[in-house]
């Protein structure tokens, strides 16, 4: 029995619902009395959802999964995963048994966009050209880990004297703090770009230092 799943990972935003697609080709006149369906975590073999003896056996996965009743007899064994969490990321296997048996695995990639970075400056007053300042760029509650880039007002990348740390909170979402140490010129704009590599989403923050006062656009 051929079981079909998408080759590419399913990308789902944290807190939204995801559909893990799985399909088979039923013969004409097929009914659900003939179907055994199991969804499980590929690595641990933990049961996620099942259908057997003509009945949806329900979710074994925190009551957050559901099948598509009107579509099951048509060969659509897809699983709806509600309120996606970081911990859901991984591979799910769809096992279908009628008279024959088949299985296939689909990957779930979880993502969350990063917030617009907030910029802080230390010291933040009485600045003169030639002073060394520390600029901190902070962005919150993203997933997976971010890529952080700094550049000056001319778009020139700033790679030296950058320290970036990322900490996961209790939900598995990352807060990123990137610190740039720089010697001030006469005028200066410093930009931080926080990129989510899965969503290809960029969050921008910048600070412009023009003697006095500073501006945070």
């Amino acid at each position: 029995l051929e079981v079909q799943v998408p080759e590419d990972p399913v990308v789902a935003l944290v807190g939204t619902d995801a559909t893990l697609c799985c399909s088979f080709s039923p013969e004409p006149g097929f009914s659900l009395a003939q179907l055994n369906l199991i969804w499980q975590l590929t690595d641990t073999k933990q049961l996620v959802h099942s259908f057997a003896e003509g009945q949806d056996q329900g979710s074994a996965y925190a009551n957050r999964t559901a099948l598509f009743p009107d579509l099951l007899a048509q060969g659509n064994a897809s699983l709806r995963l509600q309120r996606v969490r970081v911990a859901d990321e991984g591979s799910f296997t769809c096992f279908v048994s009628i008279r024959d048996f088949g299985s296939a695995a689909v990957s779930l990639q979880v993502a969350a966009p990063y917030s617009k970075p907030s910029m802080t400056l230390e010291p933040n007053k009485d600045l003169r050209p030639g002073d060394t300042v520390t600029i901190t760029c902070s962005s919150y509650r993203g997933y997976p880990e971010a890529e952080v880039f700094w550049q000056d007002g001319q778009g020139v990348p700033l790679t030296g004297n950058v320290t970036t740390s990322q900490m996961a909170n209790e939900q598995g979402l990352f807060d990123v703090h990137s610190v740039l140490r720089v010697v001030l010129g006469a005028n200066g704009t410093y930009s931080c770009l926080v990129r989510n590599p899965v969503l290809q989403q960029d969050a921008h923050g910048s600070v412009t230092i023009t003697g006095q006062p500073m501006t945070f656009p």
């Epitope: 039923p26 004409p28 097929f30 009395a33 003509g54 949806d56 598509f68 007899a73 048509q74 060969g75």
Partner: antibody, heavy 117, light 107 residues
């Protein structure tokens, strides 16, 4: 607005052919199973055919197998029903509907097919 | 194919009364039943799916119950706009089928 609009109905002679269209708007057509249902004058609803989102898997009520063909063009957001060897008893209003996974949740207004000499 | 038999064929009731419509399946179909309402000259409208879940926008005077072979649609308090034909439908088989319908008419 989520909408289905059937067209292509009309008067046709017995033995003739007709192609019905169902234009979808307001939702991602290519993500849904779609069906055709018909209703003869004064009678009940009768399922005709169903297609999966790609159009690669189809199913028919036995009486329509071989005479009717369901197809879709996802680039045009349109569902079709090709009806051949039409008979007087095929006279009916033909509806297309979206299969939402929780019932047939969106229906068109129907198109009348009359088979008569 | 799975045959759905609805009863009664016609139900004559007055506004405000309770309507109980039945649908019997020729074999067990778990809870894979939906109910539709159809008014003259209009397309059907989804009322209930999975035997007991109300579709979006459906008033709570409509309720569904049952599992296996016997299913019921109840309209607790008939409103004038509820007089129509009601169909049950099963998705348990690849070959989808509807019941023949129950007409709810004004007494």
């Amino acid at each position: 607005e989520v909408q289905l609009l059937e067209s292509g109905g009309g008067l046709v002679q017995p033995g003739g052919s007709l192609r019905l269209s169902c234009a979808a708007s307001g939702f991602t057509f290519s993500a849904y199973y779609m069906i055709w249902v018909r209703q003869a004058p004064g009678k009940g609803l009768e399922w005709v055919s169903i297609t999966n989102p790609s159009g690669g898997v189809t199913s028919y009520a036995q009486k329509f197998q071989g005479r009717f063909t369901i197809s879709r063009d996802n680039s045009k957001n349109t569902l079709y029903l090709q009806m051949n060897s039409l008979r007087a008893e095929d006279t009916a209003v033909y509806y297309c509907a979206r299969v939402g996974g929780r019932g047939f949740d969106i229906w068109g207004q129907g198109t009348l097919v009359t088979v008569s000499s | 194919e799975i045959v759905l038999t609805q009863s009664p064929g016609t139900l004559s009731l007055s506004p405000g009364e309770r309507a109980t419509l039945s649908c019997h399946a020729s074999q067990g179909i778990s809870n894979y039943v939906a109910w539709y309402q159809q008014k003259p000259g209009q397309a059907p409208r989804l009322l209930i799916y999975d035997a007991s879940n109300r579709a979006t926008g459906i008033p709570d005077r409509f309720s569904g119950s049952g599992s296996g072979t016997d299913f019921t649609l109840t309209i607790s308090h008939l409103e004038p706009e509820d007089f129509a034909v009601y169909y049950c439908q099963q998705s348990y088989s690849t070959l989808l089928t509807f019941g023949q319908g129950t007409k709810v008419e004004i007494k």
